[in-house]
């Protein structure tokens, strides 16, 4: 049973005579008269077991003391620390020729942990140990003892274990403590990589390459490696690990970001406070959740504040110019905290009687510079229909508008385009033809471009080729042309008039009057 004694972290103790409770029971040769186990009081008045020999009167001493078998535990080089006290031969009366002041240290490798006898020829000498000039004065009980400490190393070792032996050649000596240890580079964390306990190499100059493993919640950036030096010190750290998203380095560990903090990527950065208008409610957040009514665009970095869609544009002004409209407005009061504001124009064509019945304007309308994604606060809209009710909506949008399409983001204006000359009449028909008259009917122009005040019918005999024509005006979309000559070809043109003027004449309609009094009904463009 061993008591706990504190040694450096890079030393692993294989034997510590000071920690053994009770007798050490090492083997001495000769059994009597040589090394003897003795209890002394240590500095804490606790008994400790020591071995002493003081055969200083007789020459040619050869007293051996052998430890129990010491396991190697995979170490290739071990260190032996001996604390001993040596009595000065001058302090012993009448022993000048026979007293010595050194002893010898030996070892013997063996796989057998039960060797009962000391066979001197099996042992290999490590060194002759002498008391240093510099000794430590240690208080043993109430007396000052001159305590020497000597450390020797031996290796490379290959068998399961070994024995140590101490040969006395006539000194007055006590082994106060014998400690055998090997050196390791202790488990450590460097650059967020954990390196395991690593036994040093066999040579005093060897370096053992060790690959580290990333600590919990981290990942390799570059392969982490270190070298374990012979003295048990880690050398030359290479590579590193980075804390995963949601974690930061604290005390050599990757710890979860605290509530209210986040980390988006595996970097060496620390967790950052949640950006404005966002929060995290769990530890280990990789991003922060936007507050209600706030959003983050797809390409917004996690570090950016959460933002809102903008409020509606202000001060929308319209300027109608015939079938064109120029619109201008001011930026919204609240941009939502974003710089990427732009404007979209929505055009709706509305009925005069019921403005709520609106339809999209369609593709015939043109916008300058463009309809959507406007960066300026003005737009020119052309190719509108004349004398038509239009509602224009200007939508302020930014990168998060799509997440919250709210009508508050737009401002609208309703305008009526100016009247214009109507378009031509597409279809004119002869409804009834007699010897002396033709009854005509037609459709309203596709684009009246205002209120149709009247229609004008122009007709002439085909042979005259428009050199001599007559005009008939009517508010209706039909008329009877009378006083015609029988059996004569006539050409008819119809046009509409608004306050803005006449439109173009329709395509010619050729009709031939009859010779007999019967009625011929026609609906084509060229009745005969």
């Amino acid at each position: 049973v061993t008591g706990s004694r504190v040694y450096p972290a890079n030393e692993v103790t294989l034997l510590d005579s000071r920690s053994v409770q009770g007798e050490l029971g090492w083997i001495a040769s000769p059994l009597e008269g040589g090394w003897e186990e003795v209890s002394i009081m240590d500095e804490k008045n606790t008994p400790i077991r020591t071995y002493q020999v003081c055969n200083v009167m007789e020459p040619s001493q050869n007293n051996w003391l052998r430890t129990d078998w010491i396991t190697r535990e995979g170490a290739q080089r071990v260190y032996i620390e001996i604390k001993f006290t040596l009595r000065d031969c001058n302090s012993l009366p009448g022993v000048m020729g026979t007293c010595k002041e050194t002893f010898n240290l030996y070892y013997y490798e063996s796989d057998n942990d039960k060797e009962r006898f000391i066979r001197e020829n099996q042992f290999v000498k490590i060194d002759t140990i002498a008391a240093d000039e510099s000794f430590t004065q240690v208080d043993i009980g109430d007396r000052i003892m001159k305590l020497n400490t000597e450390i020797r190393d031996v290796g490379p070792l290959s068998k399961k274990g070994f024995y140590l032996a101490f040969q006395d050649v006539g000194a007055c000596i006590a082994l106060v403590s014998v400690r055998v240890f090997y050196k390791k580079c202790p488990l450590t964390v460097r650059n967020l990589a954990q390196f395991p306990d690593t036994i040093t190499g066999a040579d005093t100059s060897s370096l053992v390459e060790v690959r580290g493993s990333c600590v919990n919640n981290s990942e390799e950036k570059d392969v982490p490696k270190m070298y374990c030096g012979a003295d048990g010190e880690w050398l030359v750290p290479i590579g590193n690990c980075l804390c995963n998203a949601g974690h930061e380095e604290r005390s050599g560990e990757c710890q979860a970001c605290k509530i209210g903090y986040y980390k988006a990527l595996s970097t060496d950065a620390t967790c950052a406070k949640c950006p404005p208008h966002s929060y995290s409610v769990w530890e280990g957040a990789t991003s922060c959740t936007c507050d209600r009514g706030f959003f983050r665009a797809d390409n917004d970095a996690a570090s950016m504040p959460c933002t809102r869609p903008p409020s509606a544009p202000l001060n929308l002004i319209s300027n109608v110019n015939e079938t064109s409209v120029n619109l201008e407005w001011s930026s919204p009061q609240n941009t939502g905290g974003r710089q990427d504001i732009s404007y979209n124009v929505v055009c709706k064509k509305c009925g005069a009687g019921d403005p709520s019945k609106c339809r999209p304007c369609g593709s015939g309308v043109h916008y300058t510079p463009q309809q959507n994604g406007l960066k300026t606060t003005k737009v020119s809209i052309t190719d509108l229909l004349a004398h038509t009710n239009y509602t224009f909506e200007i939508w302020a949008v930014n990168g998060v508008s799509k997440y919250n399409p709210n009508p508050d983001q737009s401002v609208s204006v309703t305008v009526t385009t100016n009247q214009a000359a109507p378009s031509s009449i597409a279809l004119v028909q002869a409804k009834e033809v007699t010897r002396y008259s033709v009854a005509l009917a037609w459709l309203e122009p596709d684009r009246p471009n205002g209120v149709i005040l009247e229609y004008e019918v122009k007709y002439y005999e085909k042979d005259q080729n428009e050199r001599s024509y007559r005009i008939v005006r009517t508010a209706a979309r039909n008329t009877d042309i009378k006083g015609l000559n029988p059996l004569t070809s006539y050409v008819f043109h119809v046009r509409a008039r608004t306050a803005a003027g006449y439109g173009d004449f329709s395509e010619p309609l050729e009709v031939t009057t009859n010779t007999v009094p019967s009625r011929i009904i026609g609906d084509g463009a060229n009745s005969t």
């Epitope: 008269g33 003795v38 009081m41 002493q52 055969n55 009167m57 022993v95 109430d142």
Partner: antibody
Framework: QVQLLQSGAEVKKPGASVKVPCKAS????????MSWVRQAPGQGLEWMGW????????TYAQGFTGRFVFSLDTSVSTAYLQISSLKAEDTAVYYC??????????????WGQGTLVTVSS | EIVLTQSPATLSVSPGERATLSCRAS??????LAWYQQKPGQAPRLLIY???TWATGIPDRFSASGSGTDFTLTISRVEPEDFAVYYC????????FGQGTKVEIK
């Protein structure tokens, strides 16, 4: 086991001599010094001196020079105390004791059973 | 010559009690002091040497301390076989004993 064997009691007349043997066994005789201690009846212990069993070199305490001689016969592992010109005040038990030198200090770790020398006319 | 004075001359204790014996030197003897036990009709027995180191086979109820001029031998719990006379002895260039302390049954 280690032991020191002394002879039985001696009765001597004043002026006579006595030689008290101390035979050692159980260890190498020449490896340990031998000390002599006197204890008068009802009194305490008195150290007389010691002899180096390897060299034969004796050391005498104050008051034990002249009439007291330490000697050896290493062939039989025996130390001797010889007292000449005995006086009545020499009446005492005489102990031989093996001297133990150690790093930590010295002491007499093995004692003979003692020889009572009585000096009486 | 260094004179050792032991006190008390007689110490009366009951078995199981603690006994403390004192030895004072007329000048410093460093740690060069030993303690012996002597029972009637027997040779002395070495208990302690080097002021505090147990001799072989001595039970650990015996302990000793001190250096220089003041030394103490303590028997933590006196057993029946511990009733005896106890001597201190210094070993410098010349050795001397104290006059002894008798430990008797109370």
């Amino acid at each position: 086991q280690v032991q020191l064997l002394q002879s039985g009691a001696e009765v001597k007349k004043p002026g006579a001599s006595v030689k008290v043997p101390c035979k050692a066994s159980g260890y190498t005789f020449t490896s340990r010094a031998m000390s002599w201690v006197r204890q008068a009846p009802g009194q305490g212990l008195e150290w007389m001196g010691w002899i180096n069993t390897n060299t034969g070199n004796p050391t005498y305490a104050q008051g034990f020079t002249g009439r007291f001689v330490f000697s050896l016969d290493t062939s039989v592992s025996t130390a001797y105390l010889q007292i000449s010109s005995l006086k009545a005040e020499d009446t005492a038990v005489y102990y031989c004791a093996r001297v133990r030198f150690t790093v930590y200090g010295d002491g007499m770790d093995v004692w003979g059973q003692g020889t009572l020398v009585t000096v009486s006319s | 010559e260094i004179v050792l004075t032991q006190s008390p001359a007689t110490l009366s204790v009951s078995p199981g009690e603690r006994a403390t014996l004192s030895c004072r030197a007329s000048q410093s003897v460093s740690s060069n002091l030993a303690w012996y036990q002597q029972k009637p009709g027997q040779a002395p027995r070495l208990l302690i040497y080097g002021a505090s180191t147990w001799a072989t086979g001595i039970p650990d109820r015996f302990s000793a301390s001190g250096s220089g001029t003041d030394f103490t031998l303590t028997i933590s719990r006196v057993e029946p076989e511990d009733f005896a006379v106890y001597y201190c002895q210094q070993y410098g260039p010349s050795w001397t004993f104290g006059q002894g302390t008798k430990v008797e049954i109370k």
